[in-house]
Interface confidence: low
């Protein structure tokens, strides 16, 4: 703690200007009122002060509001952010978008900090669920960010939202993450054409049924194969050639290159050799002519 | 400071293989997708391979597909590109990027020649 | 495979100058696009991603426009340093594609 001493005759800060950035450590703590500080955080951004003196300003700050500082002075700290502890932010109560935006700046191209990920969690558990506007701001900060969250949490993202979402946000979602927001998906672009419906929609298919996948199949949509290679392989493994071959369209010659990983080498298992053959790709692996093929799930279900 | 460095670019004959790596400092490597995109003499950029960031996902351009494996080391924060059967339209300075579509950051690139 | 092609494929102009360098997609990429700055013998910088949203660090002087097929990189005020190749490329599905570039010279 920075010890209490009298400010120097003439010291007395009246407002927040550079003049101040020649203040000793004990000077600041001494001649800058906490109040003023507060009214005119805004200029603080523009200051070059050092980390020690933000220290001083953040510790004024800290003794003029010990239950946490109100949105006014948060929207305005700027650098002085970085400053501040996951403890420090969970006295906050951030409620405007605006806010959020300005300390998302701050920390914008670094990983996402202890800070940051507090600071989202106090601002979305304050909104009580992810609407559009704050996924399009916390998702064009951090692309990572949807998945970063438990099904759970996604859970509470109205389909309204989903417009907000872009392919690379979803690039590190696993499977059950995609399964609680491709129905989502499925509702907020249910009134698009069928073209139009496939490009909104691609992003999310690893959350896709089997039913949903056939009836894509019939819609011309040549599905690549980056797509299909993403989808859940419990819904794959019951496609037959004729669905999948219509579902990749073009795309189906890259099924070769990928005969050896899921969910395509395990799809070609379950398809009859003959059926393969007709693809003319050379795809080997398939259940050999004469055999019976077994629903192994409904086995199980008696057994 | 995010850094890429590209090494293993050499003169190589047509039909043999050479294997290049990509050495990055400076972020957490095994968070992010990386890729290696081409630019030949004269030519513009080409996008040649893909991979996820635990290394369980692969995309190659149709022209290396076959030829060319790309992997990572994420204990050691290095990419690579292996390229076997090279042939003289693979000679390129090659690059590796970081970023899922959009590739934020470079490396300056390590030249590949192919010639007999 | 998505065919990018860009417009003009090299161009000149002054100091101060507005330019605009068009980017056009064979199909439907929505707003998959981003665009990168190539200096000789320097690597791609990335300048615009989602077509429009200008990444940290570049002035604001580059802006981008456009989705669906037709695309646009404009730089309201030319400065010295912007004469470069412009590249752009989608990222809507895979393979990733770029443009041919657009070299951008001094009158």
């Known amino acids: 703690e920075v010890e209490k001493t009298a400010c120097p005759s003439g010291k007395k800060a009246r407002e927040i200007d550079e003049s101040l950035i020649f203040y000793k450590k004990w000077e600041l703590e001494a001649c800058v009122d906490a109040a003023l500080l507060a009214t005119q955080m805004d200029r603080v951004n523009a200051i070059p002060f050092t980390y020690e003196q933000l220290d001083v300003l953040k510790h004024k700050l800290d003794e003029l509001y010990p239950q946490g500082y109100p949105e006014s002075v948060i929207q305005h700290l700027g650098y002085l952010f970085l400053k501040m502890s996951p403890e420090d932010i969970r006295k906050w109560n951030v409620t405007s978008l605006e806010t959020l935006k300005a300390l998302l700046e701050v920390n914008k191209g670094h990983e996402m900090s202890p800070q940051v990920a507090t600071l989202i969690d106090r601002f979305v558990k304050g909104r009580g669920q992810l609407d559009k506007d704050t996924l399009d701001t916390l998702t064009a900060f951090y692309p990572g960010y949807l998945c970063s969250l438990s099904p759970e949490e996604l859970s509470s993202v109205p389909p309204s939202s989903i417009w907000a979402v872009r392919p690379q946000d979803l690039d590190t979602c696993d499977p059950r993450q995609l399964d609680v927001l491709y129905p989502k998906a499925r509702l907020a672009f249910q009134n698009m054409n069928g073209s139009e419906y496939f490009v909104k929609i691609q992003s999310f298919l690893g959350g896709a049924p089997t039913e949903d996948l056939k009836a894509l199949s019939q819609q011309n949509v040549s599905m690549d194969l980056a797509t299909f290679m993403k989808l859940r392989t419990d819904a794959v493994l019951p496609l037959t050639v004729a669905e999948v071959q219509k579902l990749l369209g073009p795309h189906v010659e890259g099924l070769k290159a990928e005969e050896r990983h899921r969910p395509v080498r395990d799809w070609i298992l379950r398809q009859r050799q003959d059926d393969l053959d007709t693809l003319g790709l050379g795809l080997q692996g398939g259940i050999p002519n004469g055999y019976l093929v077994l629903d192994l799930s409904m086995q199980e279900a008696l057994s | 400071e995010v850094q890429l460095v590209e090494s293993g670019g050499g003169l190589v004959q047509p039909g043999e293989s050479l294997r290049l790596s990509c050495a990055a400092t400076?972020?957490?490597?095994?968070?992010?997708?990386m890729h290696w995109v081409r630019q030949g003499p004269g030519k513009g950029l080409v996008w040649v391979s893909r991979?996820?960031?635990?290394?369980?996902?692969?995309v190659y351009a149709d022209s290396v597909k076959g030829r060319f494996t790309i992997s990572r080391d994420n204990a050691k924060n290095t990419l690579f590109l292996q390229m076997n059967s090279l042939r003289a339209e693979d000679t390129a300075v090659y690059y590796c990027?970081?970023?899922?579509?959009?590739?934020?950051?470079w490396g300056q690139g390590t030249l590949v020649t192919v010639s007999s | 495979d998505i065919q990018m092609t860009q417009s003009p494929s090299s161009l000149s102009a002054s100091v101060g100058d507005r330019v605009t360098i068009t980017c056009r997609a064979s199909?439907?990429?929505?707003?998959?696009l981003t665009w990168y700055q190539r200096k000789p013998e320097k690597a791609p910088k990335s300048l615009i991603y989602?077509?429009?949203s200008l990444q940290s660090g570049v002035p604001s002087r580059f802006s981008g426009s456009g989705s669906g097929t037709d695309f646009t990189l404009t730089i309201s005020s030319l400065q010295p340093e912007d004469f470069a190749t412009y590249y752009c490329?989608?990222?809507?599905?895979?393979?990733?594609?770029f443009g041919q570039g657009a070299k951008l010279e001094i009158k």
């Open positions: 490329q989608q990222y809507k599905s895979y393979p990733l594609t």
């Open positions: 400076g972020f957490t490597f095994s968070s992010y997708w």
């Open positions: 990027a970081r970023g899922r579509g959009i590739m934020t950051y």
């Open positions: 991979i996820n960031s635990d290394g369980t996902s692969t």
């Open positions: 199909q439907d990429i929505g707003s998959w």
């Open positions: 989602a077509a429009s």
